[in-house]
């Protein structure tokens, strides 16, 4: 039975050119994280962390995504390309998969609303 | 075009060691992490490790931690694989092999090189 | 580690035929699985990652699918050029571990 819940940053705005760190975290569950996938708004992978094997990044954007903390993922040299939906993928055990949500604004603005709590100012 | 060109074959004595060289081209070498696979004669490939070589960061199979060291050389494109303690049972080819787009399977490999080990 | 089987271990087969290739795995590995071609003094060619996807200029005779821990590789029509051994791969976790490997050879 899958008891665990997902917590995310939920809708989060940042500065275009800026960064912002994408976070979920797995609670109210004992299951171990065995694998975290990253994948953007068209279900294209960013990146994969793997408790064993540690993080593969998408080649594409290995320049501008980079690992952490913790599972999360922080991205940069923000663009407005890059608003959009975010997907965190819990693989558990022996829970089983497990699926969050974050939705990215970029901004054009100098003065972007700071809205995440895990945004990097 | 990707390219994995890998050194020539070694003949070493038990005990002693072996570093075998992977030069890429044809693709951002920063940008793929590099995995080392080894295949004994008749016998099934053999994971050993992979590196990333943006960061130097890397990953070993625990059957050959104590005894395998994968590097880079980002100037040159090149990883390498160093195997120490060498015994009979390393007779192999060693493969070095990039890693996919989409996780840690690997998309392609270089030609192998022969080491093989004998008193 | 996460134990790899295949089946059969060797197959014959003709021209035309339609082939399938199993590969069990002893833990669920959800869908990271890859399949390998090996001719002999060659090095592995990728075909299929993540299970069920085609790696770039493989052929559409070849096809996977699968999840879990029971996975399947098959070759539609049989060519010429496809007699050579299999593996399959996981790609979840540390070591990363082969299957022993198919042989398709010409009956």
């Known amino acids: 039975m899958m008891t665990g819940t997902i917590e995310t940053t939920g809708n989060i705005s940042a500065k275009k050119g800026g960064s912002v760190i994408l976070q979920c975290h797995l609670s109210s569950t004992m299951a171990q994280v065995t694998q975290v996938n990253w994948e953007q708004h068209d279900h294209s992978l960013l990146a994969i962390r793997n408790a064993e094997l540690g993080w593969h990044i998408y080649p594409a954007f290995k320049d501008r995504v980079a690992p952490g903390p913790g599972l999360g993922l922080t991205l940069q040299s923000l663009t407005m390309n890059d608003t959009g939906e975010y997907f965190c993928t819990y693989h558990t055990y022996p829970d089983g998969t497990y699926r969050g949500r974050i939705f990215l604004e970029v901004l054009e603005s100098s003065v972007a609303e700071h809205s995440a709590r895990f945004q990097i100012p | 075009e990707v390219q994995l060109v890998q050194s020539g074959a070694e003949v070493k004595k038990p005990g002693a060691s072996v570093k075998v060289s992977c030069k890429a081209s044809?693709?951002?070498?920063?940008?793929?992490?590099m995995h080392w696979v080894r295949q004994a004669p008749g016998q099934r490939l053999e994971w050993m490790g992979r590196?990333?070589?943006?960061?130097?960061?890397?990953k070993y199979n625990e059957k050959f931690k104590s005894r395998v060291t994968i590097t880079v050389d980002k100037l040159s494109s090149t990883a390498y694989m160093e195997l120490s303690s060498l015994r009979s049972e390393d007779t192999a080819v060693y493969y070095c092999?990039?890693?996919?787009?989409?996780?840690?399977?690997?998309?392609?490999w270089g030609q192998g090189t022969t080491v093989t080990v004998s008193s | 580690d996460i134990q790899m089987t295949q089946s059969p271990s060797s197959l014959s087969a003709s021209v035309g035929d339609r082939v399938t290739i199993t590969c069990r795995v002893s833990?669920?590995?959800?869908?990271?699985l890859a399949w390998y071609q090996q001719k002999p003094g060659k090095s592995p060619k990728l075909l299929v990652y993540?299970?069920?996807t085609l790696a770039e200029g493989v052929p559409s005779r070849f096809s996977g699918s699968g999840s879990g821990t029971d996975f399947t590789l098959t070759i539609s029509s049989l060519q010429p050029e496809d007699f050579a051994t299999y593996y399959c791969?996981?790609?979840?976790?540390?070591?990363?571990?082969f299957g022993p490997g198919t042989k398709v050879d010409i009956k």
């Open positions: 833990e669920n590995i959800y869908s990271y």
């Open positions: 092999a990039r890693e996919g787009h989409y996780g840690f399977y690997s998309d392609y």
């Open positions: 590196i990333d070589p943006d960061s130097g960061g890397s």
């Open positions: 993540n299970a069920k």
């Open positions: 791969q996981h790609h979840y976790g540390n070591p990363l571990t």
């Open positions: 044809g693709y951002t070498f920063t940008n793929y992490y």
